[in-house]
């Protein structure tokens, strides 16, 4: 019964936020580079 409970943990949330922040930075950098190259 206890398997799989408490999966929406703060540690998981922080990791997800860090990944989102990283991806936003990478994509933002690529976008700026494309604009610059135009």
């Amino acid at each position: 019964h206890s398997d799989g409970i408490f999966t929406d943990s703060y540690s998981r949330y922080r990791k997800q936020m860090a990944v989102k922040k990283y991806l936003a930075a990478v994509l933002g950098k690529r976008y700026k580079q494309r604009v610059k190259n135009k």
Epitope: H1, S2, G4, I5, F6, T7, D8, S9, Y10, S11
Partner: antibody, heavy 113, light 110 residues
Framework: QSVEASGGHLVTPGTPLTLTCTVS????????MNWVRQAPGKGLEWIGS??????KYYASWAKGRFTISRTSSTTVNLKMTSPTTEDTATYFC?????????WGQGTLVTVSS | AQVLTQTPSSVSAAVGGTVTINCQSS????????LSWYQQKPGQPPNLLIY???SLASGVPSRFSGSGSGTQFTLTISDLECDDAATYYC??????????FGGGTEVVVK
Amino acid sequence: QSVEASGGHLVTPGTPLTLTCTVSGFSLSSAAMNWVRQAPGKGLEWIGSVDERQNKYYASWAKGRFTISRTSSTTVNLKMTSPTTEDTATYFCARGGGEFFIWGQGTLVTVSS
Amino acid sequence: AQVLTQTPSSVSAAVGGTVTINCQSSQSVYSNNRLSWYQQKPGQPPNLLIYEASSLASGVPSRFSGSGSGTQFTLTISDLECDDAATYYCAGAYNTGIYGFGGGTEVVVK
């Protein structure tokens, strides 16, 4: 990302009342939501929760008195089936499984005749 | 039912001092570490300080620290500041999917 509880007001004892928790910035399909209450001048009391898979858990004292339901990808309800004066409190909803990391401001429920 | 006993119920300390709050659970929390600590100020919702017994939540000063495992846990606030005046709660998660809160500790800063 935020959560907000609403629907609290003055009710007479025995009159059912439904509170709503509305979330923004995330989906309830990947989040566990909890209801916690606080009587005036008292401590925090966990009522129950609904997890990502819609499993529901209740404090032993809350079984039969409260019903939690996920009504959409952004809303969770707490139904007070037959409130008594002892249920007068601020009701908070909070996200988290294992700990509560996003809290709403809370909604005040007053049960009085 | 799970019972979390928090002591003391109130504590007073001077600015720059240290406060220790204890939380004892009637049974082991989930994974022996699913114990969290919250700060609450009047008219506000609680705010997560410590999760998984000893991990500091984002944006929380390192003056706050948590320790413990199983059934015994401690929150320590060092270099006390006026802004630390609040009520502090522990909360435990248990392997039946339920939670419990401690009764709270009021911290008064002199």
